[in-house]
């Protein structure tokens, strides 16, 4: 991955590097240090620094993104003297030339979906490529299965989702013969970027009073417990007026989920349908297919 | 109905093993993940390890390494935990729970307790 | 030693509104991890109350609500019963470790 890193130090260099594939950053060891601290500044001023022992000479960022251009600082003092380092790690390339419009989707628990635009400025000969190393492993994946627009990669279809884990790092390089091209990365948390399936198994029991409707949870990607699912129950009398409200019902996930409203005979034809969402994000599945109850002449 | 029930009190020798049992009735347990808890006498509850999606594998709290083992018998659907080399200080009770949420770990339905006493 | 404190106790008169508290530090609640919230009847089994920090279980009365500030959290009991008096334990995730971390308890009376 080609980036320019440009080192401003003082006389006697610690000799700072990073590598942005382990996020790593290491310096040489000084003799009989007593101190060191290493951070990152973005260009928003925001200051990134993780925990080092001591007797360390590197330190590894876990949860950053790099494309708008940071810079590494390293501080040791040692029983003689102190050394301080900045590393500027800028985006080199063509401004506007890096994929933009990034996102992805996992839909169908087991299949993920990215998409992205080619860069405003970038040259006619671009290639884009991604890479996705999860937080736990440092594992890296490279795209299987490319989305091509005129022979460009615009997108990648992912179909074995093993390598990921909660939080993940996504990394589109590009390439050109023509002038370099800046890099985009981002970190996406899988439980955010998850579309649910509607609810299984829905099912409607009635007795002379009451209609009982079950359901099951849909399956998901993330491994997610009854408790983290909110459902909508849309309850419908067929043949109404149009304009008419439906019944929205808000139910939370139970380890048997069901809902049981009153409906006495002869109860008109209706219709229920489902959705489900995670109870913290509420980003709704598409509805279920609607499940009929009752007569026409009720 | 879910329930989970839980075996009988036990009164076990220092050095000793124990095994409680918990049964999961009106689900199949292959759909479920189950935490073991403890709380000694007058005191307050302590995880002991349980199924973690994250690791795909069953963890175990710190002080618990070596000495517990979770098992799971899918075809009784009962959930096992067995604790060796027990001390005094292991009396206790022992709940199993039903994980509710796992992003934190909630626990949403526990077993009724089983008392184990560590005496010599 | 809980990393999560809580008063060991807490008293209210039928009808009132209590409130426990449950502090915790940067690792845990604030670093943020959702907090639930359990009651223990006397003799009983614990049961979950509260989760991802204001949301009930069906079943559980209206009466009872939680909430989360920083590194805090806290379970309001409004319109005090009797068959409230229990132990009340509040839980979390410590960064870096597996499971769930409980705090020590606080013991709820209903004068």
């Known amino acids: 991955e080609k980036s320019d890193l440009r080192t401003v130090a003082p006389a006697s260099s610690l000799n700072v590097r990073f590598d942005s594939r382990t996020m790593n950053l290491s310096w040489d060891c000084q003799e009989n240090t007593t101190f060191s601290k290493c951070f990152l500044t973005d260009k928003k001023n925001r200051v990134v620094e993780p925990r080092l022992s001591n007797n360390e000479c590197s330190c590894t960022f876990r949860e950053i993104c790099l494309h708008e251009g940071v810079t590494f600082e390293v501080h040791v003092n040692t029983s003689q003297r102190g050394f301080q380092q900045k590393l500027l790690y800028p985006n080199s390339g063509r401004e506007g030339t890096a994929a933009q419009n990034f996102s992805c989707f996992i839909y169908n628990a087991d299949l993920m979906n990215c998409t992205w635009a080619r860069g405003p400025t970038a040259p006619r000969d671009v290639q884009y490529f991604l890479y996705i190393r999860n937080s736990k492993r440092r594992r890296e994946i490279r795209c299987p299965y490319y989305i091509q627009d005129s022979g460009t990669h615009v997108g990648c279809h992912l179909d074995n989702l093993s390598g990921l884990t909660s939080r993940n790092y996504f990394l589109v390089n590009g390439t050109s013969r023509e002038i370099g091209i800046q890099f985009f990365d981002s970190l996406l948390d899988t439980k955010k970027i998850e579309r649910f399936n509607p609810p299984s198994n829905v099912t409607v029991r009635c007795n002379t009073t009451h209609c009982l409707v079950r359901w099951k949870q849909p399956r998901t990607y993330q491994k997610l417990s009854y408790l983290d699912f909110q459902y909508q129950l849309d309850v419908h009398r067929k043949n109404t007026q149009p304009g008419t409200e439906n019944l929205l019902i808000n139910v939370s996930g139970d380890l048997e989920n069901r809902y049981n409203f009153p409906s006495s005979e002869p109860r008109a034809k209706h219709s229920v349908k489902i959705r489900a969402a995670d109870v913290r994000i509420l980003n709704w599945s598409s509805w279920s297919e609607a499940i009929e109850f009752g007569s026409d002449d009720g | 109905q879910v329930q989970l029930v839980q075996s009988g009190a036990e009164v076990k020798k220092p050095g000793a093993s124990v095994k409680v049992s918990c049964k999961v009735s009106?689900?199949?347990?292959?759909?479920?993940?189950i935490h073991w808890v403890r709380q000694a006498p007058g005191k307050g509850l302590e995880w002991m390890g349980g199924f973690d999606p994250e690791e795909n594998e069953i963890v175990y709290a710190q002080r618990f390494q070596g000495r517990v083992t979770m098992t799971e018998d899918t075809s009784t659907d009962t959930a096992y935990m067995e604790l060796s080399s027990l001390r005094s200080e292991d009396t206790a009770v022992y709940y199993c729970?039903?994980?509710?949420?796992?992003?934190?770990?909630?626990?949403?339905?526990w077993g009724q307790g089983t008392m184990v006493t560590v005496s010599s | 030693q809980s990393v999560l404190t809580q008063p060991p106790s807490v008293s209210g008169a039928p009808g009132q509104r209590v409130t426990i508290s449950c502090t915790g530090s940067g690792s845990n609640i604030g670093a943020p991890y959702d907090v639930s919230w359990y009651q223990q009847l006397p003799g009983t089994a614990p049961k979950l109350l509260i989760y991802h920090n204001n949301k009930r279980p069906s079943g559980v009365p209206d009466r009872f609500s939680g909430s989360k500030s920083g590194t805090s959290a806290s379970l309001a009991i409004t319109g005090l019963q009797a068959e409230d008096e229990a132990d009340y334990y509040c839980?979390?995730?410590?960064?870096?470790?597996?499971?769930?971390?409980f705090g020590g308890g606080t013991k709820l009376t209903v004068l």
């Open positions: 729970a039903i994980v509710g949420s796992f992003s934190p770990l909630t626990l949403g339905l």
């Open positions: 839980a979390t995730v410590e960064a870096g470790l597996s499971g769930s971390v």
């Open positions: 009106g689900y199949t347990l292959t759909e479920l993940s």
